[in-house]
């Protein structure tokens, strides 16, 4: 994965500072907290299963 | 490089316990949810069990046909978690993986580890 | 419980030539955005290895011949061009809701 301040992450994912690695920003269905969810310009996240 | 360290396993009466235990190094182990997957050639995969991270208050989840006879639990000070697993039954044996999971799929695991429930 | 059936059971395939394996889920695992289907390998002796993440993202290290495709309910993992190194189960899974489950997984050889 990218290093913040290069390459910026693929389509589809955003950088976590908190996992130091570009993430899937389908994860934010699960968790919509996460700090790379910041990034993901997708719709708001469905309600997750639990 | 990211490691799953799997102890516990081996042979058990039908009715007994045995808890598995699982070290994690070579990712920031707190922030991911953590599972126990068995496999058998009846059943196949099987997911077993869940524990999620502190951001998630520790919930645990579990399948059904394990809940009120197994365990999960994790300590992040040392990168670790368990499977603690009562009155087991034949049906419970088979190859036992741990594994992390940010929140959708099984992207680490561990090597294995065989449980034989026979008299 | 979310049924996952893959097809075909096992599967032999001349190398080089492309293997198709079908998964389907007895309720969609879809929303709009993204499909929470997962491939894995697995190799006798070794755990399962991710391949295919979200239907169709191919996980770091895996080589550009695995590709996933599907939305809904009906999912595919292709392989072109198979090699001998592609000689495994594949398995589907899905991650939609609790409880997690896999497919029966599909047995490739190659020919």
């Known amino acids: 994965e990218q290093a913040p301040g290069t390459a910026p992450c693929s389509r589809g994912s955003s950088w976590s500072a908190d996992l130091d690695k570009c993430m899937d920003c389908a994860a934010c269905r699960a968790r919509p907290h996460s700090d790379f969810c910041l990034g993901c310009a997708a719709a708001p996240p469905a309600p997750f299963r639990l | 490089q990211v490691q799953l360290q799997q102890s516990g396993g081996g042979l058990v009466q039908p009715g007994g316990s045995m808890k598995l235990s699982c070290i994690a190094s070579?990712?920031?182990?707190?922030?991911?949810?953590m599972s126990w997957v068995r496999q058998s050639p009846e059943k196949g995969l099987e997911w077993v069990a869940e524990i999620r991270s502190k951001s998630d208050n520790y919930a645990t989840h579990y399948a059904e046909s394990v809940k009120g006879k197994f365990t999960i639990s994790r300590d992040d000070s040392k990168s670790r978690f368990f499977l603690q697993m009562n009155n087991l039954r034949a049906e419970d044996t088979g190859i036992y993986y741990c594994?992390?999971?940010?929140?959708?799929?099984?992207?680490?695991w561990g090597q294995g580890t065989d449980l034989t429930v026979s008299s | 419980d979310i049924v996952m059936t893959q097809t075909p059971a096992s599967l032999a395939v001349s190398l080089g030539q492309r293997a198709t394996i079908s998964c389907r889920a007895s309720q969609s695992v879809s929303t709009s955005t993204y499909s929470y289907m997962h491939w894995y390998q697995q190799k006798p002796g070794q755990p399962p290895k991710l391949l295919i993440k979200?239907?169709?993202s191919l996980e770091s290290g895996v080589p550009a011949r695995f590709s996933g495709s599907g939305s809904g309910t009906d999912f595919t993992l292709n392989i072109h061009p198979v090699e001998e190194d592609d000689t495994a189960t594949y398995y589907c899974q899905h991650s939609w809701e609790i409880p997690y489950t896999f497919g029966g997984g599909t047995k490739l050889e190659i020919k």
């Open positions: 979200y239907a169709s």
């Open positions: 070579g990712f920031t182990f707190s922030s991911y949810w």
């Open positions: 594994s992390s999971t940010y929140a959708d799929y099984f992207h680490y």
